[in-house]
């Protein structure tokens, strides 16, 4: 018996943890950290042999309505 959409997410991809606006969510470790601990990846020079790594960084998701902007994907996540 199918369980519905929830099972599509799988155990490896839980929903991002809601951080207070003062913090940011780190997708790599899957918890909130000081935003200064996150590093936006620098683009690789053109012609690099390996593809650019996916970033594990994401701005904070706010707790509660209207407390801050929703999390936006970084270029590396697109």
């Amino acid at each position: 018996m199918r369980r519905g959409p929830r099972s599509l997410r799988g155990r490896d991809a839980p929903a991002p943890t809601p951080c207070v606006p003062a913090e940011c969510f780190d997708l790599l470790v899957r918890h909130c950290v000081a935003c200064g601990l996150l590093r936006t990846p620098r683009p690789k020079p053109a012609g690099a042999s390996s593809p650019a790594p996916r970033t594990a960084l994401q701005p904070q998701e706010s707790v509660g309505a209207g407390a801050g902007e929703a999390a936006l994907p970084l270029p590396g996540l697109l």
Partner: antibody, heavy 118, light 113 residues
Framework: EVKLVESGGGLVQPGGSLSLSCAAS????????MSWVRQPPGKALEWLGF??????????EYSASVKGRFTISRDDSQSILYLQMNALRAEDSATYYC?????????WGQGTSVTVSS | DIVMSQSPSSLAVSIGEKITMSCKSN????????????LAWYQQKPGQSPKLLIY???TRGSGVPDRFTGSGSGTDFTLTISSVKAEDLAVYYC?????????FGAGTKLELK
């Protein structure tokens, strides 16, 4: 009205322990991280650490000056924040404030005084 | 640790005067992804606890009068009071929350001339 009321301060000998409490009301306690900040007499503010909310697993961050000696915990059912202080030193003497942390330290208590002296 | 330096350490003012105070960090507090500066200002009146004035470097806290304005980006920040009132006499602290440990400046004390 937002209220944060600290208690438990007092005089303690070096090497001793003390537990501070902070009773919160007037805001959604579970939405906030809760922090402790201290201020020695006539000096600047010093952040000690904070505890995240249940949604973030009640994880904690501490300053190097208190890590391993102080422990922050919270009881969401009663909206109370705790600071357990062990191996106290003279330099821990200060007014201790609790603060609700969300956009920054949005709400502050009135403070409780701790004196470490023999 | 990020070091926050405030100047001047004290400021003698007259009521109605426009004043500015400075806060500098030894590394940038700007998170490029959301273009926010992780800097707050607090006011502490004599014998009282601190109160949040400004966060994100320029957003006023709840109930803070519009005579208080925060500005700056990166490493250099300013708090301006457009017309000082008697109730503004206090110590003003800046604080970074960009990285742990969260750190405060030593404060700027606003006193009467």
């Amino acid at each position: 009205e937002v209220k944060l009321v600290e208690s438990g301060g007092g005089l303690v000998q070096p090497g001793g322990s003390l537990s501070l409490s902070c009773a919160a009301s007037g805001f959604t306690f579970t939405d906030y991280y809760m922090s402790w900040v201290r201020q020695p007499p006539g000096k600047a503010l010093e952040w000690l650490g904070f505890i995240r909310n249940k949604a973030n697993g009640y994880t904690t961050e501490y300053s190097a000056s208190v890590k391993g000696r102080f422990t922050i915990s919270r009881d969401d059912s009663q909206s109370i924040l705790y600071l357990q202080m062990n191996a106290l030193r003279a330099e821990d003497s200060a007014t201790y404030y609790c603060a609700g942390y969300r956009n920054a330290m949005d709400y502050w208590g009135q403070g409780t005084s701790v004196t470490v002296s023999s | 640790d990020i070091v926050m330096s405030q100047s001047p350490s004290s400021l003698a003012v007259s009521i109605g005067e426009k004043i500015t105070m400075s806060c500098k960090s030894n590394q940038s507090l700007l998170y490029s992804t959301n273009q926010k500066n992780y800097l707050a200002w607090y006011q502490q009146k004599p014998g009282q606890s601190p109160k949040l004035l400004i966060y994100w470097a320029f957003t006023r806290g709840s109930g803070v009068p519009d005579r208080f304005t925060g500005s700056g980006s990166g490493t250099d920040f300013t708090l301006t009071i457009s017309s000082v009132k008697a109730e503004d006499l206090a110590v003003y602290y800046c604080q970074q929350y960009y990285i742990y440990p969260l750190t405060f400046g030593a404060g700027t004390k606003l006193e009467l001339k």
